[in-house]
Every structure is written in structure tokens, then in C-alpha cells.
Amino acid sequence: LRCHVCTSSSNCKHSVVCPASSRFCKTTNTVEPLRGNLVKKDCAESCTPSYTLQGQVSSGTSSTQCCQEDLCNEKLHN
């Protein structure tokens, strides 16, 4: 499996070949109103998706997206 693995304040891309144990490409997007943003993309052995309501961004939120195809975590939103 190939995933994008990177950390940034916005969308980022950096493709790597994951370890054999990794079954998921994972994207965690954290938005805090005073603290800024963090996008973290990784290979993952397990992944539990969590989605947040559209209107929550201004009050601080975090979401996790999971997918299982090569470079499927290229975009911030599947």
C-alpha cells in the first residue's frame, strides 16, 4: 500500500510505500479557532473514521478519514 505521509497546516502530499502491516491510509484534520490547523497523513494498521458536522469548524474540531487504496489520502475530503 502507498499513502501520503506528511504533516502540514493545510493539505500536503508526500507518497511513501507503507510497511506490510499497514492496511489503511489515514488523514487526521484538526482545526482549532485560536490554535491553528494540523493535517496529519499516515500509514496505519488500523483506522476508525470520525466525521464532524460542517458548522463545527469555528468552535474547534477534529476528523479522521480512512481509505485502503494507493495514494487515496491525497485529498483532504474523500
Partner: antibody
Framework: EVQLVESGGGLVQPGRSLRLSCAAS????????MHWVRQAPGKGLEWVSG????????GYADSVKGRFTISRDNAKNSLYLQMNSLRAEDTALYYC???????????WGQGTTVTVSS | QSVLTQPPSVSGAPRQTVTISCSGS????????VTWYQRLPGEAPKLLIY???LLHSGVSDRFSGSKSGTSASLAISGLQSEDEAEYYC???????????FGGGTKLTVL
């Protein structure tokens, strides 16, 4: 070029007011939270206040709460700090800073000096 | 008194490695990421490290960060004269609901 330029500092008597401004350029100002950080002579950095992109969230250090007011005008790409009831201990170099990456000030201005003295 | 604790000064000879420590508590470093800034004489602070150990773009890879529990450290390898500056650690504090800084560490290159 990404840039923050502070202005409005100066010498002021205790108890008086001052308004600092920060002009932003080179990035989409209304995408980011902005902050004021100060450094008193011979001291370390101290966070003063922060404001979210849409002014919906605002925070202050306990040392300035009730005296300072942060605001922003996204149409003018500008950040402000209204400082009332100034004290000698507010004497410092005041920086405005942009928050991009979580918990990190990735762009800083050169600072404007505020001196509170009679 | 700063919320985060740093040594006031450290020094090292050129090409050596120096480490600057930063001690906090469960409400800041223990729960949140650590950021490191460099302040060269007469200049504005500059972001070096964010999210504990990630190098900001354009920063030399001679700088590295690490964190364990409620403490963090900044290592500078292959020390150069231009590294002479003040270094500050910072973290968000959940109790104070804002960012907190260390008192700063002045690095002298001998």
C-alpha cells in the same frame, strides 16, 4: 512576500491608552488566527491575546484581561490591539504573529515598542 | 516567572552538539505539542520546530526536537557561530487557555 508590520507604539503615561495595528500582506489574512505576543526588557516572550479568523473566538492572558481588546478587519488585512489603563509592566516590544500550523506562530512582525512611563 | 522552565544559558564550541531542555506540566506539554523558536539579536522570533519534532520549512536539519512526558528538548548539532541566539519553547496550556512560553535560553558559541 509574506509580511506583518506593526505600528502604533510609543511613549505613554500610566493609565492612558494606546492602539496598536498590524498590517498583513502576502497571504490570505482571513484564513488564519492572529495573535499578539510581547517581550518586556530583559524578559522572555509572553502571549498577550489571540483572535480567530472570523473573530468568533478571542483569548487574553490574565495579565491584560479587562484592559486590552483585540480585533481584526479582514477587509483591510489588519489586526489591532486596543490597550487601556496601561501600566509600567506593559512596557515591552509587541509582536503580531500568524498562526498557521497548530500551536505554532509561523510568521512574526518586527515588533513595535510600547513604553509606559510618567 | 515563566510557565515553562528553560535553562537561562547554554554554550558549546563550534561543531559540537548542545541540548536545551524545556520542562512543563500535564496541562501544557503533557497534553499538547511543543514548538521551538529562535530569536537572533535584533530580529523577530523565527519558528524552528513544531508539533514536537517537525522541522519548519527552510530550517536547517541540524536542529531537532523531541518530547517525553512533560518535558521537551531542542538539540543543535554541528554548532555554528550564526546559531548564537535566544531559544524559546512554547506549548498550549489547557488551564490558562492560551499559549505559554519558556523564559528563553541564550546560546553562546565559544
Amino acid at each position: 512576500e509574506v509580511q506583518l508590520v506593526e505600528s502604533g507604539g510609543g511613549l505613554v503615561q500610566p493609565g492612558r491608552s494606546l492602539r496598536l495595528s498590524c498590517a498583513a500582506s502576502g497571504f490570505t489574512f482571513d484564513d488564519y488566527a492572529m495573535h499578539w505576543v510581547r517581550q518586556a526588557p530583559g524578559k522572555g516572550l509572553e502571549w498577550v491575546s489571540g483572535i480567530s479568523w472570523n473573530s468568533g473566538s478571542i483569548g487574553y492572558a490574565d495579565s491584560v484581561k479587562g484592559r486590552f481588546t483585540i480585533s481584526r478587519d479582514n477587509a483591510k488585512n489588519s489586526l489591532y490591539l486596543q490597550m487601556n489603563s496601561l501600566r509600567a509592566e506593559d512596557t515591552a516590544l509587541y509582536y503580531c504573529a500568524k498562526t498557521g500550523i497548530l500551536d505554532a506562530f509561523d510568521i512574526w512582525g518586527q515588533g513595535t515598542t510600547v513604553t509606559v512611563s510618567s | 516567572q515563566s510557565v515553562l522552565t528553560q535553562p537561562p544559558s547554554v554554550s558549546g564550541a563550534p561543531r559540537q552538539t548542545v541540548t536545551i531542555s524545556c520542562s512543563g506540566s500535564s496541562s501544557n506539554i503533557g497534553q499538547n505539542s511543543v514548538t521551538w523558536y529562535q530569536r537572533l539579536p535584533g530580529e523577530a522570533p523565527k519558528l524552528l520546530i513544531y508539533y514536537d519534532d517537525l522541522l519548519h520549512s527552510g530550517v536547517s536539519d541540524r536542529f531537532s526536537g523531541s518530547k517525553s512526558g512533560t518535558s521537551a528538548s531542542l538539540a543543535i548539532s554541528g554548532l555554528q557561530s550564526e546559531d548564537e541566539a535566544e531559544y524559546y519553547c512554547a506549548s498550549w496550556d489547557d488551564s490558562l487557555k492560551g499559549p505559554v512560553f519558556g523564559g528563553g535560553t541564550k546560546l553562546t558559541v565559544l
